[in-house]
């Protein structure tokens, strides 16, 4: 004969464990079931009743099978230099990420605590490395015969053109000026191509990517001729 | 106010390690690239090692290359430098410097009071 | 790795004399080139940057110049104050050296 199914709440066998998505309660002695995701517990259960469940509030969540009395508050609303990603419902908390030229410079269990600018590369300098989601652009003086004329966070180093005369020849932050008509590229090895990610706290010297400046910040930074731009979002 | 303070420096014998720290407050400790600059008693400063903001590049000068490491925690807001296999000519005052925010703001904008390294049997 | 010459190694002068440091790279370091101040006993302090943009809360006595590989730090008026050591120091590619200082001293 097939064992007998046992309805919540019922006493463990001795040693024995509660089933998926339930719990042992202490004060009752008793696995009871578990509220699942978007509920919490309003009653707990007795020897001879089950687990109460009900809906969370709004701007609250459970993720998980669970038997908390109340249900979690959600984040506060997302920063202005962030864009929600995932929205507060009952199952889920809000999900706050860096908007586009920004980066995660410190990270939270979800989302994000503080979001910074992207560096940006002067003129001379070129992206080495382009920015993620949690890191920085990582800038490098443009080598001999490349250049770059912009301040940005996605330029990277560009080939001087080739002149057949030179009018005024090309530097790290300038190209060639051509009298001709028809100028051409060079192809400089590696100047057209951002090179491959150096392997993490690399030591290297020029020209692999060196550093920069602090990130864009307009408020909360001190002083300092220019410094980084950065924005706190809500715990 | 920025306030940068190193410390762990000292007495060490030739071929020794030691660890400086410094301990960085004031602002957005995770979102600037930082350095040590050395100045040996009575001579002029020198460059000795930069990590960007995110601890993923890495720079050093050649006199140090493969003996120091820089290092930073941006939780805890501190930078350190694990130097090994020290000689003489590493005595110095080290100093904790914010910058350069290389590419973009390339200067040394704050400097910490200077920890004082003594190599010396 | 890119050398800088500074000059000169000291100087004197009285309170009110014009004074002039130089600096020059032995490659173009395209401006990207601080000065900085030291004073006995004391941390360096950015004076310029970029060459030419002074440092928030720094006199307007003080000026940077230059491009390319020839630099130079000018200080108008000089005042008691401004008795110290300077450095020049470049940001272009690895290692970022300094210039051997500028000890300006009282005559």
């Known amino acids: 004969l097939p064992a007998q199914v046992a309805f919540t709440p019922y006493a463990p066998e001795p040693g024995g464990t509660c089933r998926l998505r339930e719990y042992y309660d202490q004060t009752a002695q008793m696995c009871c079931s578990k509220c699942p995701p978007g509920q919490h517990a309003k009653v707990f259960c007795t020897k001879t009743s089950d687990t109460v469940c009900d809906s969370c509030e709004d701007s609250t969540y459970t993720q998980l099978w669970n038997w908390v009395p109340e249900c979690l508050s959600c984040g506060s609303r997302c920063s202005s230099d962030q864009v929600e990603t995932q929205a507060c419902t009952r199952e889920q908390n809000r999900i706050c990420t860096c908007r586009p030229g920004w980066y995660c410079a410190l990270s939270k269990q979800e989302g994000c605590r503080l979001c910074a600018q992207l560096r940006k590369c002067r003129p001379g300098f070129g992206v080495a490395r382009p920015g993620t989601e949690t890191s920085d652009v990582v800038c490098k003086p443009c080598a001999p015969g490349t250049f770059s004329n912009t301040t940005s966070s996605t330029d990277i180093c560009r080939p001087h053109q080739i002149c057949h005369v030179v009018a005024i020849p090309g530097n790290a932050s300038m190209d060639a000026v051509c009298t001709s008509t028809s100028p051409t590229r060079s192809m400089a090895p590696g100047a057209v191509h951002l090179p491959q990610p150096v392997s993490t706290r690399s030591q290297h010297t020029q020209p692999t990517p060196a550093p920069s400046t602090a990130p864009g910040t307009s408020f909360l930074l001190p002083v300092g001729p220019s410094p980084p731009a950065e924005g706190s979002t809500g715990d | 106010e920025v306030q940068l303070v190193e410390s762990g420096g000292g007495l060490v014998q030739p071929g020794g390690s030691l660890r400086l720290s410094c301990a960085a407050s004031?602002?957005?400790?995770?979102?600037?690239?930082l350095s040590w600059v050395r100045q040996a008693p009575g001579k002029g400063l020198e460059w000795v090692a930069y990590?960007?903001?995110?601890?993923?590049?890495?720079y050093y000068s050649d006199t140090v290359k493969g003996r120091f490491t820089i290092s930073r925690d941006n939780a805890k807001n501190s930078l350190y430098l694990q130097m090994n296999s020290l000689r003489a000519e590493d005595t110095a005052v080290y100093y904790c410097?914010?910058?350069?925010?290389?590419?973009?703001?390339?200067?040394?904008?704050?400097w910490g009071q200077g920890t004082l390294v003594t190599v010396s049997s | 790795d890119i050398q800088m010459t500074q000059s000169p190694s000291s100087l004197s002068a009285s309170v009110g004399d014009r004074v002039t440091i130089t600096c020059r790279t032995s490659e173009s370091i395209y401006s990207n080139l601080p000065w900085y101040q030291q004073k006995p006993g004391k941390s360096p302090k950015l004076l310029v940057y970029?060459?030419?943009k002074l440092a928030e809360g720094v006199p307007s006595r003080f000026s940077g110049s230059g491009s390319g590989t020839d630099y130079t730090l000018t200080i108008s008026s000089l005042q008691p104050e401004d008795f110290a050591t300077y450095y020049c120091q470049h940001f272009w590619v690895t290692p970022w050296t300094f210039g051997q200082g500028t000890k300006v001293e009282i005559k």
């Open positions: 004031g602002f957005a400790f995770s979102t600037y690239d």
């Open positions: 410097v914010r910058g350069p925010f290389y590419g973009s703001a390339n200067y040394f904008d704050y």
């Open positions: 990590i960007n903001n995110g601890g993923i590049s890495t």
């Open positions: 970029d060459a030419t």
